[in-house]
Amino acid sequence: GLECDGRTNLCCRQQFFIDFRLIGWNDWIIAPTSYYGNYCEGSCPAYLAGVPGSASSFHTAVVNQYRMRGLNPGTVNSCCIPTKLSTMSMLYFDDEYNIVKRDVPNMIVEECGCA
Amino acid sequence: GLECDGRTNLCCRQQFFIDFRLIGWNDWIIAPTSYYGNYCEGSCPAYLAGVPGSASSFHTAVVNQYRMRGLNPGTVNSCCIPTKLSTMSMLYFDDEYNIVKRDVPNMIVEECGCA
């Protein structure tokens, strides 16, 4: 997946620093207090959706074949989304105020693609 | 996730019949010749992203918290995408013209959500 570098408007991964204190979540998340979560942005022209490594699934490729032939669903915009997310450990208070360590999936955007 | 019923413009699952003959894939896919693959469409207002069951990840919820506070990344559109996909068996010709049966992941959109 592309890294956003200011020179592309295509779907890419933008580095993004997340600080739990800024959103008031530091009252229940103990650690980490911040991390690079990143996000996806940019355009998804038709030729990008369904490209292996860019498409998030077989389904995306099939739907894109329909679009390229002018068939329905032609009106649905292709979307720049995370295609690879990674896990991160967290220490936090649960509902009963116990401290819990959990490996939380989908915390960090590693790659973006058009779906 | 919502089912598209013609009465909502919110992110929902639209039933969609996929026929491999229409996209010329019947020359390598033996079975099935068609199936309901479905797709996602509709708008994603800020309040929908990050709602459990609608958000595709913890990451979505965090980024949405930033948006709701007017912080970056505020300009990135939330996107109606598959949050649950299911597997389907296929019979097809591989590159060496052997007939192969494979359980292909991400063939059918089961639920949609805002990411």
Partner: antibody, heavy 126, light 108 residues
Framework: EVQLVESGGGVVQPGGSLRLSCAAS????????MHWVRQAPGKGLEWVSL????????YYADPVKGRFTISRDNSKNSLYLQMNSLRTEDTALYYC???????????????????WGQGTTVTVSS | DIQMTQSPSSLSASVGDRVTITCRAS??????LNWYQQKPGKAPKLLIY???SLQSGVPSRFSGSGSGTDFTLTISSLQPEDFATYYC??????????FGQGTRLEIK
């Protein structure tokens, strides 16, 4: 079941070298930092060294600094400890240990050791 | 480096007893403390993390408390399989990672 299996221990003379290996199975090896911890006969636990998941950072206890080198090969799910200039006080059972924390940048670790190997014995004697 | 001191270094107790082991850090480590159990001839096992949280699969008779510099591990009703050596470990600072010297729990 997550498993760690050490090998490479043995008897060596003072000033000699040994290379310990640890083979990991059934977990995403490169997600986790790995440690070597040793235990001299009849003594307590002593942390020896640590390497982060990507191999980018390494740390050592003062008694082994400059003599031991920790490394990993994520493609082989393997951890190593190269031990040079061995001393009699290095005699111990050496454990390969998985850390339990999956870190992200900026690297925040809460070091905890949730999976231990069975240990490999290193004897330094003349 | 942060030093960890356990007391007592050994103790004798009977099945059914309530047992407390203490661990003191040379400087404040907040709640970043882990406890391990080691049985003879076996590798250590993580019992408690973050001073008071039970690791998955550990019996509820084990509990931990404390914050700052003083911590305790309590076994509410000693079982035969609990006779072992117990170690505390601080996880507050960057390495070196330090363990306490251990507390050996023996059958009276």
């Amino acid at each position: 079941e997550v498993q760690l299996v050490e090998s490479g221990g043995g008897v060596v003379q003072p000033g000699g070298s040994l290379r310990l290996s640890c083979a990991a199975s059934t977990f995403t090896f490169d997600d986790f930092a790995m440690h070597w911890v040793r235990q001299a006969p009849g003594k307590g636990l002593e942390w020896v060294s640590l390497i982060t998941g990507d191999g980018g950072s390494t740390y050592y206890a003062d008694p082994v600094k400059g003599r031991f080198t920790i490394s990993r090969d994520n493609s082989k799910n393997s951890l190593y400890l190269q031990m040079n200039s061995l001393r009699t006080e290095d005699t111990a059972l050496y454990y390969c240990v998985k850390d339990w924390w999956i870190a992200a940048r900026p690297d925040y670790y809460y070091y905890g050791m949730d999976v231990w190997g069975q240990g490999t014995t290193v004897t330094v004697s003349s | 480096d942060i030093q960890m001191t356990q007391s007592p270094s050994s103790l004798s107790a009977s099945v059914g007893d309530r047992v407390t082991i203490t661990c003191r850090a040379s400087q404040s480590i907040s709640s970043y403390l882990n406890w391990y159990q080691q049985k003879p001839g076996k590798a250590p096992k993580l019992l408690i993390y973050a001073a008071s949280s039970l690791q998955s699969g550990v019996p509820s008779r084990f509990s931990g408390s404390g914050s700052g510099t003083d911590f305790t591990l309590t076994i509410s009703s000693l079982q035969p399989e609990d006779f072992a050596t117990y170690y505390c470990q601080q996880s507050y600072s960057t390495p070196p990672i330090t363990f306490g010297q251990g507390t050996r729990l023996e059958i009276k």
